[in-house]
């Protein structure tokens, strides 16, 4: 079938980087500037992606492949093929529609993106809190209270973990 199709359809012979030009008796014409065709046999070339705003050009467009974008410092990629840029926050914060907001008490975020997550509840695993949590760091759980030598004290465990939420305004 493919052989028959190629005999009947001259467009199937047009390689990537060209298009089958109906205005010129189906001659294979090179893609115009700022356009590309990544597969053969195409009747049009696609417009190259433009990396505008905080999008930066990671890879230039060529006649056979689209441009690729990433995000300038202060923002990070979201979506397939970096279709969006989203702002970074500091560690100990999460992004809301009101901008970057500090994590509520009992929650933390150790990255520049994502939401604040509850501190680990050490007591659920029968352990004690070795190092208190902060806005930027989870608690560190230590041995269970029963494992501690007599007279040894541990830091008071945190309140039960809450759902991640935004700081009150």
């Amino acid at each position: 079938f493919e052989r028959t199709r190629s005999l009947q359809d001259p467009c199937s012979n047009c390689p990537a980087g060209t298009f089958c030009d109906n205005n010129r008796n189906q001659i294979c014409s090179p893609c115009p500037p700022n356009s590309f065709s990544s597969a053969g046999g195409q009747r049009t070339c696609d417009i190259c992606r433009q990396c505008k705003g905080v999008f930066r050009t990671r890879k230039e467009c060529s006649s056979t492949s689209n441009a690729e974008c990433d995000c300038t410092p202060g923002f990070h990629c979201l979506g397939a093929g970096c279709s969006m840029c989203e702002q970074d926050c500091k560690q100990g914060q999460e992004l809301t529609k009101k901008g970057c907001k500090d994590c509520c008490f009992g929650t933390f975020n150790d990255q520049k993106r994502g939401i604040c997550r509850p501190w680990t509840n050490c007591s659920l695993d029968g352990k004690s809190v070795l190092v208190n949590g902060t806005k930027e760091r989870d608690v560190v759980c230590g041995p269970s209270p029963a494992d501690l030598s007599p007279g040894a004290s541990s830091v008071t465990p945190p309140a039960p973990a809450r759902e991640p939420g935004h700081s009150p305004q």
Partner: nanobody, 123 residues
Framework: EVQLVESGGGLVQPGGSLSLSCAAS????????MNWVRQAPGKEAEWVAN????????YYVDSVKGRFTISRDNAKNSLFLQMNSLRAEDTAVYYC????????????????WGQGTTVTVSS
């Protein structure tokens, strides 16, 4: 073609005012959150302000609160940023950006950007 075009930038003295505009085309403007983002020379890009679809919600980065006002005119497919009491640290390229389709649902990505307009605050 989906497009955003900013205008209104220029040179202004400290304490002065400037109004930026952003003309949107190629999409249903009234259906999207819109944002202003700026990038100062040699610094990281910074979100400045956003506004929801009908203009009833507006939010600002702390450094511009009380000085900048974001607004929109859905009938004219336009976004605005009124900047008062300008400071040297407001010098930057200002970009208009469309909030992505799930903006506000734990995601705040911006998918369509203009080329930017330059604001210089200097005496």
């Amino acid at each position: 073609e989906v497009q955003l075009v900013e205008s209104g930038g220029g040179l202004v003295q400290p304490g002065g005012s400037l109004s930026l505009s952003c003309a949107a085309s190629g999409f249903t403007f009234r259906s999207f959150w819109m944002n202003w983002v700026r990038q100062a020379p040699g610094k990281e890009a910074e979100w400045v302000a956003n506004i929801n679809q009908d203009g009833s919600e507006k939010y600002y980065v702390d450094s511009v609160k009380g000085r900048f006002t974001i607004s929109r005119d859905n009938a004219k497919n336009s976004l605005f940023l009124q900047m008062n009491s300008l400071r040297a640290e407001d010098t930057a390229v200002y970009y208009c950006a469309r909030g992505g389709p799930d903006y506000g649902d734990l995601h705040y990505g911006m998918d369509v950007w203009g080329q930017g307009t330059t604001v210089t605050v200097s005496s």
